[in-house]
Interface confidence: medium
């Protein structure tokens, strides 16, 4: 295996809590830049399984404004454009790691924080029950 | 917007670095036990558009190992069970906040980083270009 | 490959501890986290507790709360599981298991145990 | 604690046959149920993750179903190599518990 010294610069933690309690540089480093910046934008409306996107804002989170998928059928869009109820519409859930402000209404503590949220919808094929 | 009061039991960080530099705690409060538990984790199969699961691996990075949805075909799955080209099977893409270790190798020291993964597929119309 | 090797057999008196150790090879420490788990004779699987590689951050099962420790040496690869207070109820085989820090269809996944170590046979006998 | 309950507690069955094994946990724990065989003298090995997510290098006889509360282990067609005990195994809340286990023999 990869064998790591550990780092000398490292700060040293005198925290009662360490190592539950450390220090976080929030200056966000964006990975994405050399992604392809043509994004799932319009996928929510092209998609056979379209969504509407809800905003869910909370001041005392980071990010504070999150979007989330809604699907808009129970079923999906067939070649026709109507809705076909042998298939099912279905969020596409993802958790996400945010910080909450703690104790409250601190600028400088806080907690790490799992939420799950929906990002999109896809077209499944039902699970069907049969009834002996 | 609304003016939140800063609440007078936040510790006080001397660092010279902040704001951007905070406490946070890593003990993950889970905010996910109220929501149905029913994961979407068998829809990468089920899904018009299936997916396959890759791993992209990291050691500086949480969570170090991130399982990355792509598309099994570029078409999507019809009735019939065979891939229809007349539609597409598109990445459902997300930003994520991840933590690295900053500097390197320190275990209680950490910038917020954020990057983009694709959690999974749905099937969308194409979008068609007509030459003149 | 991925591998986990422990510390050999130890034949202990009550009231004395034991520290068994695991030294993983074949995949980046930081990348997931070392679970303990042990097997009374005949008896099924107890996790007692783990740490979480990148953070440092250890949680242990009640029932060894107090009396159990685990520590992990990034720079060795090894990871620790140190039981104090030992009577015969403690005589087991003690596994190590790796746990992956993954983020899996989705989740923030809490984890299996993806590969294990091959078991140090504790005794405690006066 | 999350109490999971195996069962059967034994089961002596012939090569080739179909082998079941269920698991049921004291309360919702989604997907986050996973299995693991152990033979005698060895240390556990994982079979499937996250409820029916197969391991490379596991025999495609091995699968996995269930969500929720209750969970199943099966084994298409067994074979003589695949005795042992199998155990399932909760993450979906600290501590991690285990099943009481089920041991598989051949006729």
């Known amino acids: 295996g990869i064998t790591i010294p550990r780092n000398p610069g490292c700060p040293n933690s005198e925290d009662k809590n360490f190592p539950r309690t450390v220090m976080v540089n929030l200056n966000i480093h964006n990975r994405n830049t050399n992604t392809n910046p043509k994004r799932s934008s319009d996928y929510y409306n092209r998609s056979t399984s379209p969504w509407n996107l809800h905003r869910n804002e909370d001041p005392e989170r980071y990010p504070s404004v999150i979007w989330e998928a809604k699907c808009r059928h129970l079923g999906c869009i067939n070649a026709d454009g109507n809705v076909d109820y042998h298939m099912n519409s279905v969020p596409i859930q993802q958790e996400i790691l945010v910080l909450r402000r703690e104790p409250p209404h601190c600028p400088n503590s806080f907690r790490l924080e799992k939420i799950l949220v929906s990002v999109g919808c896809t077209c499944v094929t039902p699970i069907v029950h049969h009834v002996a | 917007g609304i003016t939140i009061p800063r609440n007078p039991g936040c510790p006080n960080s001397e660092d010279k670095n902040f704001p951007r530099t905070v406490m946070v705690n890593l003990n993950i409060h889970n905010r996910n036990t109220n929501t149905n538990p029913k994961r979407s984790s068998d829809y990468y199969n089920r899904s018009t558009s299936p997916w396959n699961l890759h791993r992209n691996e990291d050691p500086e990075r949480y969570p170090s190992v991130i399982w990355e949805a792509k598309c099994r075909h570029l078409g999507c799955i019809n009735a019939d069970g065979n891939v229809d080209y007349h539609m597409n099977s598109v990445p459902i893409q997300q930003e994520i906040l991840v933590l690295r270790r900053e500097p390197p190798h320190c275990p209680n020291s950490f910038r917020l980083e954020k990057i983009l993964v694709s959690v999974g597929c749905t099937c969308v119309t194409p979008i068609v270009h007509h030459v003149a | 490959e991925v591998q986990l090797v422990q510390s050999g057999a130890e034949v202990k008196k009550p009231g004395e501890s034991v520290k068994i150790s695991c030294k993983a090879s074949?995949?980046?420490?930081?990348?997931?986290?070392i679970s303990w788990v042990r097997q009374a004779p005949g008896q099924g699987l107890e996790w007692m507790g783990g740490?979480?590689?990148?953070?440092?951050?250890?949680d242990y099962a009640q029932k060894f709360q107090g009396r159990v420790t685990i520590t992990a040496d990034e720079s060795t690869t090894t990871a620790y599981m140190e039981l104090s207070g030992l009577t015969s109820d403690d005589t087991a085989v003690y596994y190590c298991?790796?746990?992956?820090?993954?983020?899996?269809?989705?989740?923030?996944?809490?984890?299996?145990?993806?590969?294990w170590g091959q078991g140090t046979t504790v005794t405690v006998s006066s | 604690e999350i109490v999971l309950t195996q069962s059967p507690d034994f089961q002596s069955v012939t090569p080739k046959e179909k082998v079941t094994i269920t698991c049921r946990a004291s309360?919702?724990?989604?997907?986050?149920l996973h299995w693991y065989q152990q033979k005698p003298d060895q240390s556990p090995k994982l079979l499937i993750k996250?409820?029916?997510h197969s391991i490379s290098g596991v025999p495609s006889r091995f699968s996995g179903s269930g969500s929720g509360t209750d969970f199943t282990l099966t084994i298409n067609g067994l074979e003589a190599e695949d005795a042992g005990t199998y155990y399932c195994h909760q993450s979906s809340e600290l501590p991690h518990t285990f099943g009481r286990g089920t041991k598989v023999d051949i006729k």
């Open positions: 298991a790796r746990e992956p820090n993954e983020f899996w269809n989705g989740y923030y996944a809490t984890h299996d145990f993806d590969y």
């Open positions: 074949g995949g980046s420490f930081p990348s997931y986290g």
């Open positions: 740490i979480t590689n990148f953070f440092g951050i250890r």
């Open positions: 996250y409820a029916s």
């Open positions: 309360q919702d724990i989604g997907y986050e």
